[in-house]
Amino acid sequence: SEGRKTWRRRGQQPPPPPRTEAAPAAGQPVESFPLDFTAVEGNMDSFMAQVKSLAQSLYPCSAQQLNEDLRLHLLLNTSVTCNDGSPAGYYLKESRGSRRWLLFLEGGWYCFNRENCDSRYDTMRRLMSSRDWPRTRTGTGILSSQPEENPYWWNANMVFIPYCSSDVWSGASSKSEKNEYAFMGALIIQEVVRELLGRGLSGAKVLLLAGSSAGGTGVLLNVDRVAEQLEKLGYPAIQVRGLADSGWFLDNKQYRHTDCVDTITCAPTEAIRRGIRYWNGVVPERCRRQFQEGEEWNCFFGYKVYPTLRCPVFVVQWLFDEAQLTVDNVHLTGQPVQEGLRLYIQNLGRELRHTLKDVPASFAPACLSHEIIIRSHWTDVQVKGTSLPRALHCWDRSLHDSHKASKTPLKGCPVHLVDSCPWPHCNPSCPTVRDQFTGQEMNVAQFLMHMGFDMQTVAQPQGLEPSELLGMLSNGS
């Protein structure tokens, strides 16, 4: 059975990509680089420059061992662009022998008018332009090629699609004299798929479209369109699936209503309503038909779009998602939480749990957090004793077996995993919370007290003493 991974303290960064020497493979010629050693003493800088140049030219050959790097490819079709008109692109790490392809959509909020897009361009240009993208990225979590970090998908072909359209992957409008920015999220996905077909995707068995945060919502908005695109291009045998992480939002009532001034304070329904018009946003056809013209914003909300999707989708969502709380104007500042807010937060968890009731493939831990699948410690969190990679593996199996007309859940291999305990961090495997101001890790007891929970009140309904409850939470039972 699955070994419990204790190998990276929660919240820590993954190790840098290894820089290891690798001998040339058998039969490969060893290239030689001429170095001019004359008058080295007189011109050390020039000599060092040559050595540096040599090292840089050798690096791509040497970093073959545990190299986690995905390499940047800007789109050949340069008319499919980021917000500022620079070409969009993707990072790719191919895996010989695998017919599984993982396409990951990056997240990073959105902007929905000229003012907040200008501000975003000033402060977060990487999310609007490809001009400063690095040549490589390290694959972590579900994008890792290390079996210990990514137990079930390590051998897949990995594709990371950077988010540079600021439109929740929904836009279909190009930059023009009238439009200061292009919003081409939906078109970027289509173009990446088209280019990947020439790089081996044509032989795929399974394409998993995954994403976190705005990328997770992007999965819900695009998964059926990708399946349709592949069918039209003559690849109906490729099974398209979705994995939406932290993109299942509620259009609930904000804790405190504020006017729609900027991305963070604007109620999500209003932000999306404005965004769709600004981006020329497109939503899944079957969902669009369910709502009147001008009401397409509804399709950005998981519980409304999900029932209309044809492709299988696995939903991963923290019950107390930090981005959801942010748009609901809940800001945990370090001051103890008042009862009204505590009840609001608990109710949010209850509502979210309710929306996942009919989602057969779901993983929803009772934690206060945001995003999980490309975190290095994504294997740590468990719901009812099952980790997320294990649940995804069970989902794989259930989809494989459903072709054999078996509709019953696999024994000992659950895919519907939603925490039922009612308060944040009642699940002992939740990522460690840090005090926003001191940076100190908080244990469960400190966190719950900070959240304004009286330990007596929490323990009583479970027939426990507060000390017993704290012991259980600390030990992970």
């Epitope: 991974k5 190998w7 990276r8 820590q12 190790p15 545990l66 695998s98 390590w154 051998n155």
Partner: antibody, heavy 118, light 106 residues
């Protein structure tokens, strides 16, 4: 040249513990996961667990969890496996193996023979 | 856990012959499979990884094939140094080895 040099044979009594070593050379020790594998006499191979020398992260086969402990000493590029509460069933050859870029074990130690007998 | 069923348990062959060893997984392992050779008194040696890729410095008479749950290792034109035990191994969640196949000289 990559080499994994394991410690010599061990003869121990039932109930005791043993700690064997695997010294790595010829590559950057912290960049590769190290796995341990058991082979009983005339039998197949059985995976015990792994350790990542970079940060000490590990994972175990449930069967060995709690009885096997994997550690490393980065300064000497050495991986260790301690086995506790030994019985005759633990008599076997134990290998350390480096997990390379292929996702599989590209270099193996020569093995440490453990005999548990009273 | 995923089980790996290797067959045959043993086989006899002569130098120059071709032999095939198979490995069946209890469920789809998506080519996350390797083959190792172990000669008496030696450590195992990686032959083939991710189902079909030949490891460095392994002669081309060895080849791997298969996908899904069924995989095989073929050795063409057997050489004296090829006799020994062969193991399949997968790395998909945890690591599991097949029971092994003993290849003996006829």
């Amino acid at each position: 040249e990559v080499q994994l040099q394991q410690s010599g044979p061990e003869l121990v009594k039932p109930g005791a513990s043993v700690k064997m070593s695997c010294k790595a050379s010829g590559y950057t020790f912290t960049d590769y996961y190290m796995h341990w594998v058991k082979q009983s006499h005339g039998k197949s191979l059985e995976w015990i667990g792994y350790i990542y020398p970079n940060n000490g992260g590990n994972g175990y086969n449930q069967k060995f969890k709690g009885r096997a402990t994997l550690t490393v000493d980065k300064s000497s590029s050495t991986a260790y496996m301690e086995l506790r509460s030994l019985t005759s069933e633990d008599s076997a050859v134990y290998y350390c193996a480096r997990r390379g870029a292929t996702g599989f074990f590209d270099y193996w130690g020569q093995g440490t023979t453990l005999t548990v007998s009273s | 856990d995923i089980q790996m069923t290797q067959s045959p348990d043993s086989l006899s062959a002569s130098v120059g012959e071709t032999v095939t060893i198979t490995c069946r997984a209890s469920e789809n392992i998506y080519s996350t499979l390797a083959w190792y050779q172990q000669t008496p008194g030696e450590s195992p040696q990686l032959l083939v990884y991710t189902g079909t890729n030949l490891a460095d410095n392994i002669p081309s008479r060895f080849s791997g094939s298969g996908s899904g749950t069924q995989y095989s290792l073929k050795i063409k034109s057997l050489q004296p140094e090829d006799f020994g035990s062969y193991y399949c191994q997968h790395f998909y969640g945890t690591v599991t080895f097949g029971a092994g196949t003993k290849l003996e000289l006829k």
